[in-house]
Amino acid sequence: EVEKTACPSGKKAREIDESLIFYKKWELEACVDAALLATQMDRVNAIPFTYEQLDVLKHKLDELYPQGYPESVIQHLGYLFLKMSPEDIRKWNVTSLETLKALLEVNKGHEMSPQVATLIDRFVKGRGQLDKDTLDTLTAFYPGYLCSLSPEELSSVPPSSIWAVRPQDLDTCDPRQLDVLYPKARLAFQNMNGSEYFVKIQSFLGGAPTEDLKALSQQNVSMDLATFMKLRTDAVLPLTVAEVQKLLGPHVEGLKAEERHRPVRDWILRQRQDDLDTLGLGLQGGIPNGYLVLDLSMQEALS
């Protein structure tokens, strides 16, 4: 808490300018009018204050706006944003994308702080959904943003926003998140032709069901092994050897290097060894000839 003392003669601030960097903390508290500070917030970020001094300025704004800062002030916080707590930010009503961008810029190049997470949460909740412009902005600053959301939160992403998603934005998504995003992507890209569609949908295929993979296998897509390895195991298991061969095209040879890893390992165990041999890759572990395969999961479903 800054000690309250009367402003020394001749030191009352008439404007927010660089002379204030030479004020002690108590002088800033005593000599800077909070209303003046609020109207000239756009100047603060250009002045080389210490964070110690910014703390005093924050204190003045907190006294002026105990219910939370207006957006006109928030937009110009600059590095003062770093002194805000999540509790402070929860009082704000941020509606402008420009304000969001200005504050994200302060944190650029660093991992998402609790302040930034709270700010984004407030902004998105205020908008009601993750629209394309917001998603564009957030993934530009934080490529992993999408994958930090819960499946419930992702459900509010409209299919039109999916156009803003880049492959790297999905790198850390888990299958539950892709389960939510894939149908949206399918809807968003539905009017594209085969090869263009595959390029766009590829990053989302970790959420694709078996029937969609079967359909893709008929389109000469030549899926790479990295994408195949990210497919849902339960979606891959029902695929036949012929379907996998068509799906991967020339990349089918890569199965050999991945035969001990999921989903390839589990898929091999479900195939007839005869069928696997037709690939000529030396894949082992298939069902020996003459064995009967009982699908117990199907039997349970019927009983």
Epitope: P48, Y51, Y79, L82, K83, H110
Partner: nanobody, 116 residues
Amino acid sequence: QVQLQESGGGLVQPGGSLRLSCATSGTIFSRNGMGWFRQAPGEQRELVARILNDGTTMYADSVKGRFTISRDNAKNTVLLQMNSLKPEDTAVYYCGYSDYRGTDYWGQGTQVTVSS
């Protein structure tokens, strides 16, 4: 985190000179350049001089024309040349900077005493 180490303080007569040096243990990424601050007993810390990242220098009115701040990039040091020293310049002098993450960094300080 980069360490800051001040040196060059001491006892000097009024009108005398001292040259303070602030050595940094590595490259600093500062939002507001490097500053020399001072703190007299019972007082709060105040900025004396600052050199911004672009080389611009700024001085408190009380030291203008007497103190000069400069930077030696090759040696990772910031200097404060203090001339025409007065008794009211007596204080512990600190160098410091602010990072891009919300933290101020200070050295341990060096005592400057101006007395006859």
